[in-house]
Structures are given as C-alpha cells and as structure tokens.
C-alpha cells in the first residue's frame, strides 16, 4: 500500500516523539555534574551496522532493556525519569514505526558504544528519517 499523507504525518509525529524522548534522556544524563555519569559510561551498548530505514529500529528495540537498566541509575529527587514508563513508551513507538509484518534480523557493529554514543546515534537516525519525510 502506498503511503498516504496522513500515514506519513503519523510516522513523522511518532518519530518526533521518539526523538524528544531520546533527547530528554541524553540531556538528563549527559551533564558533567551528574555524579553517576562515569559509572554509566562503563555500560556498553550494541550499535547497528546500518540504520537508514524504519525497519532498522529493531536494533534499538533489542537494546531497550539494557537502556532501562542504566537509566535506573539516573534518578534523583528533582529529576524523575521513571525509566520503566519511559522505555515502555519508546517501545510502543518503535513497534509501531518498524511494523511487525516483516521480521528483520538486526546486524550489529563490532565495536560497542557508551550510552551517550548510543543515544546520539539514534537521535541522528530519527532526525535523518524526519528530514526525508518533511
């Protein structure tokens, strides 16, 4: 089925939502004053070999559990990330965006990345896809 303007708009909105969530996480943790940042950086994430299409979001989906584990370290009285809710929201968006019709086997790069590099990669991906839709 050819994409309609309404389905394109929906995809764009979902990507913008995903982008905002990823940026919020990054801004919340990538602060030189964050007392847990150095320890959060010891966690390693798998990066996609290729991320140019919505189906490649499978690679993000597979890393959401490790992401939640690291985000559990990021809470403070004045910064309520609520990792479980946030990851659940991201998961819903990712599932809708990548679709469940085709099963895509994610291919990962050899080198692992820090949480900051990982988030930046998926932020760049989201921005890139949004730019092709607008």
């Amino acid at each position: 089925m050819a994409p309609t303007s309404s389905s394109t708009k929906k995809t764009q909105l979902q990507l913008e939502h995903l982008l905002l969530d990823l940026q919020m996480i990054l801004n919340g943790i990538n602060n030189y004053k964050n007392p847990k940042l150095t320890r959060m950086l010891t966690f390693k994430f798998y990066m996609p070999k290729k991320a140019t299409e919505l189906k490649h979001l499978q690679c993000l989906e597979e890393e959401l559990k490790p992401l939640e584990e690291v985000l559990n370290l990021a809470q403070s009285k004045n910064f309520h990330l609520r990792p479980r809710d946030l990851i659940s929201n991201i998961n819903v968006i990712v599932l809708e965006l990548k679709g469940s019709e085709t099963t895509f086997m994610c291919e990962y790069a050899d080198e692992t990345a820090t949480i900051v590099e990982f988030l930046n990669r998926w932020i760049t991906f989201s921005q890139s896809i949004i730019s092709t839709l607008t």
């Epitope: 964050n34 847990k36 320890r39 010891t42 370290l73 009285k77 004045n78 910064f79 692992t112």
Partner: antibody, heavy 121, light 111 residues
Framework: EVQLVQSGAEVKKPGESLKISCKGS????????IEWVRQMPGKGLEWMGV????????YYNEKFKGQVTISADKSISTAYLQWSSLKASDTAMYYC??????????????WGQGTTVTVSS | AIRLTQSPSSFSASTGDRVTITCKAS??????????MNWYQQKPGKAPKLLIY???NLESGVPSRFSGSGSGTDFTLTISSLQSEDFATYYC?????????FGGGTKVEIK
Amino acid sequence: EVQLVQSGAEVKKPGESLKISCKGSGYAFTNYLIEWVRQMPGKGLEWMGVINPGSGGTYYNEKFKGQVTISADKSISTAYLQWSSLKASDTAMYYCARWRGEGYYAYFDVWGQGTTVTVSS
Amino acid sequence: AIRLTQSPSSFSASTGDRVTITCKASQSVDYQGDSYMNWYQQKPGKAPKLLIYTASNLESGVPSRFSGSGSGTDFTLTISSLQSEDFATYYCQQSNEDPYTFGGGTKVEIK
C-alpha cells in the same frame, strides 16, 4: 548471603607482578559494579577505580591510572586488580566493594575482607 | 578532587555518651536535591561497613542509634548512645564526583 571473598595475603619483591582477586556470590555479579579501594598501613581509604563486570568497562582514579589494571571474568564472578611491576609503596590492604547506584544514591554496600599486599626486598 | 575534612581526628568517650562527628567538604556534594555523602565504620583488621548513605539514610541492619544529617558541604554522624561495639574508626565518603574521596577518619576510643 551476599558476599565478596578476596584472595589471600601476598608477599612480593619490588619489580614482580601480582594479580589479586575478588569473587562475588549470593547475587547477580554482572548487575553491580565492583570498586577497588586502597588502605596504606595506618592510613585512610583511597578509591582506586571501578569495573562493570558485565561489559568490562572501567574507570580509574587518575592517581592510579597506569599503575594498576582492573579486570573481571564474569563466567566465574570474579574481579581482579593487578600490577605489572610492584613498588615498595604498593604495600597496603586492598579492598573490593560492590557499588549500589539505583535511585537517589551511590555507595559501597558490600565489602571484601581485604587482601594484604607486602612489597619488600 | 573534593577534599573531606573530618573532626575531631580522634577522641575518647564513655559508653552511653552522645557522640557527634563532623565532615566538611571542600565543595558541595549535592546534586538535584540529593546529598551524596556516606558514612562507614571500620574496626581494626576488618573491612569498612556502611552505616549511612545519601547523608541521612540508615543502612539495613544498622542500629537506630546511628543517624546522619547535613547537606551541601557540612555533614554530621551522630551516635545517640555509644555502645561498647561502637569503638572504631568512622569515615565519611563523597560519591558526588569522581574520584570518590574519603575523609581522614575519626577514631573513637574508650575513655
């Protein structure tokens, strides 16, 4: 019971190499970071560095960078602290400890019993 | 690195005494509403034992006679009624900034 058990006391000569261990039990070893702390005779505590046993990622106190190497083998729930060339000034008690950092805190909740390292010619 | 200065460095006290140990940081150890200051007890030949975390939270299994308070740069560990098993050295530790640092210790001896 959650515990960290360290290897026994060591007596070494200057220039020799050494690797001491810290074995975790009673909990999921890869779910918690392991820290190393030095206590020189009659002195206070100094943080040396940390390892994530799940990923192997490390972070060192600048003071100890290049002086020691921290590693881990998650298959046997063990973290290590090693020296390639010991000095007399490395004589101290070395502790491993488990880092807790979920929620609103960051502290060492479980400690090993310590490993005494004596370096003397 | 953040310097932690404990006072006094040592003192003598009797069983039943109320004991207060202070720890002053060279800069604030607060972050987004939390004070990253912990207290440990160490007995001769033994490993340190956690007493208080995040300035005022009592570790599970630690007697309620121990309490912690403070924020910013000034912190206090209080033992409301000293018991014989409390004679030991006490260390404060900041976990707000790497490298984590410890105070020089306060040795509590029997009078």
